[in-house]
């Protein structure tokens, strides 16, 4: 009896793992077996497919074969009993294509109201990712043990902290890389929980804000409690898409180590240009606290997106704002030629309700005031374009009162 | 292990313009800070310049209007060009990593430049 | 720019002996400061930054110290892979600069 070709052979990548799978064309033919050539582009002969020859099962594994990913290669099996099928031609493939993303290692620790993920692609030192190791970014989905309720965090590094959680709380959570180059999206690692450590004395510095001043940067921060020291440290940002980076290390920064104020001045001059992450802790001799939340730091913009600078008309029932460009020390205003948005907080100023404008206009009428009421203003500028993605230091609050009614005119 | 690896024609003659080769191995030019420092005879030693990851350049002022740093990262290379080199550029010529402040962690192992008519 | 003044220009001290390397700085540097080691053809060595902070790998018989515009580097125990010269550099301010070395020779 003539063998039959076996049929709907699939390909299956996953990093540097070649599975094949296909279906018998005869399952009533006992003790057959199966075997496989490939061919590379711009060649006329086949060869045999090591790993992948007189196998008895419906799946084998070519991952040995050291192949060009990047290169098309096309595939042929048969069956063999006594005699031999005819081959059966496989569509041809480039495996760099076909590649699905596996599921990423996953790290895990826990902070009292945070948790650190360290994450890693699966397959070490793979070769299908060997030029796009520094373009995979994460996503993944998180949850509260107790609720199910996800959260879903899209664009993450290797390195990275979710912050605002709970104490003495487990949390669950899962990974997925992607190619966004490549439009690759993995699959997800599998899943991972943690409990959030009980709360910490001392809680982290908060609210960090980097402002220019006379060629320096003033780094500055709140905290609840008096009598602390301060310790500010540094990490330039690309390195947190380097998972294997053995340069990864947060540095002091001399002006910033011990401070007994919650700021500090370092000259803008000690940082090379680039993006760098800051983070700060309080100390009381005995405790420390964990560290805040880094911040974004853009040498470049940094030194050039400084907070607007504005006047008020005050009406009874309104307040037109006149927003001009800022002023650099010796008063003369900053060109900023790149378009900004202003966000405009303000509040009566015996309460705590702020209330919120985005305008891209440099004149904007703060609306629905009551008269004869003191108003506070703040403002600061944000960068249009996606790519720079900057905003300024909020200015100095501005209090004015309204003025008496029927003089909205 | 981050590895520099400076090469160049070791003697060149007043006037001229001196190329060096910087090759990188171990790590890759598009992370971090790439700097030129030499050092004199008397061992006086000197700041170039540096190129970053993203491109971005400085130049020591005293060598602003003669100096050039560029680079090709599919090679994994950074250079150094100077113009118009004079007895005085006579120098063992290194380059150098930083991480974003300016102290160097890897250095090569330097390459000697003679000017000589 | 700011100048770097180090001291002494050379020393000559016995395997086991301490050392301490002075740098003066003519502006406060803020221990924006670091020290390399370099051996005779050799590339330099970072060894200190920050003023005090050891680089990785660096023996603990080496630390730095100072503030302000005074700054040292100590050597306590010397060891024979330890001599050669040393050079400090602040960065503090661009364009950074060197201290023109202490050559540390066996007596």
């Known amino acids: 009896k003539n063998l039959k070709s076996p049929q709907k052979v699939e390909v299956d990548i996953i990093d540097d793992n070649f599975i094949l799978r296909w279906n018998r064309s005869d399952e009533s033919v006992g003790n057959v077996t199966f075997s496989f050539d490939y061919q590379k582009t711009g060649m006329d002969n086949w060869i045999k497919l090591s790993g992948c020859q007189n196998i008895t099962s419906t799946k084998c594994n070519f991952s040995s074969l050291k192949l060009n990913v990047y290169e098309e290669i096309k595939l042929r099996i048969r069956a063999e009993k006594e005699n031999t099928s005819s081959w059966y031609e496989v569509d041809s493939f480039t495996p760099f294509r076909k590649a699905q993303i596996g599921p990423p290692e996953v790290h895990l620790e826990a902070e009292d109201k945070a948790i650190v993920i360290h994450i890693s692609p699966g397959t070490k030192d793979s070769v299908m990712w060997a030029l796009d190791g520094l373009s995979f970014t994460y996503s993944l989905v998180i949850w509260k043990n107790s609720s199910g309720v996800e959260e879903r965090i899209e664009n993450i590094y290797s390195r990275h902290k979710i912050y605002k959680l709970s104490p003495e709380t487990t949390y669950c959570l899962k990974v997925k890389a992607a190619l966004l180059t490549s439009w690759k999206i993995g699959v997800y690692s599998p899943v991972h929980c943690i409990k959030t450590t009980v709360e910490n004395e001392l809680p982290p510095p908060e609210n960090i804000e980097v402002s220019v001043q006379n060629q320096n940067y003033v780094l500055k921060w709140d905290y609840t409690y008096a009598n602390m020291t301060f310790q500010v440290q540094w990490l330039h940002a690309f390195l947190k898409r380097n998972p294997g980076n053995h340069l990864y290390k947060w540095k002091q920064i001399p002006d910033c180590e011990n401070v007994k104020t919650t700021q500090c001045v370092f000259p803008q001059n000690v940082f090379q240009k680039g993006i760098y992450l800051l983070r700060v802790q309080a100390s009381d001799g005995n405790n420390t606290s964990f560290w805040s939340e880094e911040i974004k730091f853009d040498t470049e913009i940094q030194a050039f997106l400084l907070p607007p600078v504005f006047n008020i008309r005050s009406l009874s029932d309104s307040f037109h704002i006149y927003i001009g460009a800022p002023k650099q020390s010796g008063n003369t205003p900053v060109i900023q030629d790149y378009p900004l948005i202003y966000e405009i907080i303000f509040w009566e100023n015996t309460s705590n309700a702020e209330r919120k404008i985005i305008e891209k206009k440099t004149d904007v009428t703060v609306p629905n005031l009551k008269p004869l009421t003191v108003y506070c203003v703040k403002a600061r500028a944000h960068t249009m374009d996606e790519k720079l993605n900057k905003s300024s230091v909020f200015s100095d609050a501005v209090c004015e009162k309204t003025k008496p009614g029927n003089t909205s005119k | 292990e981050v590895q520099l690896q400076e090469s160049g024609p070791g003697l060149a003659k007043p006037s001229q313009t001196l190329s060096l080769t910087c090759s990188v191995t171990?790590?890759?030019?598009?992370?971090?800070?790439w700097n030129w420092i030499r050092k004199f005879p008397g061992n006086k030693l000197e700041y170039m310049g540096y190129?970053?990851?993203?491109?971005?350049?400085y130049y020591n002022p005293s060598l602003k209007s003669r100096i050039s740093i560029t680079r090709d990262t599919s090679k994994n290379q950074y250079y150094l060009q100077l113009n118009s080199v004079t007895n005085e550029d006579t120098a063992t010529y290194y380059c150098?990593?930083?991480?974003?402040?300016?102290?160097?962690?890897?250095w090569g192992q330097g390459t000697t430049l003679t000017v000589s008519s | 720019d700011i100048q770097m003044t180090q001291s002494p220009a050379s020393l000559s001290a016995s395997v086991g002996e301490t050392v301490t390397i002075t740098c003066r700085a003519s502006?406060?540097?803020?221990?924006?400061l670091a020290w390399y080691q370099q051996k005779q053809g050799k590339s330099p060595q970072l060894l200190v930054y920050?003023?005090?902070t050891l680089e990785d790998g660096v023996p603990s018989r080496f630390s730095g110290s100072g503030s302000g515009t005074q700054y040292s580097l100590k050597i306590n125990s010397l060891q024979p892979e330890d001599f050669g010269s040393y050079y400090c550099?602040?960065?503090?301010?661009?364009?950074?600069?060197f201290g023109s070395g202490t050559k540390l020779e066996i007596k």
């Open positions: 150098a990593r930083s991480g974003g402040m300016y102290y160097f962690d890897y």
């Open positions: 920050n003023a005090k």
């Open positions: 502006g406060n540097i803020h221990n924006y």
């Open positions: 190129i970053s990851y993203s491109g971005t350049i």
């Open positions: 550099q602040h960065f503090w301010s661009i364009p950074p600069t």
């Open positions: 171990g790590y890759s030019i598009t992370s971090d800070y």
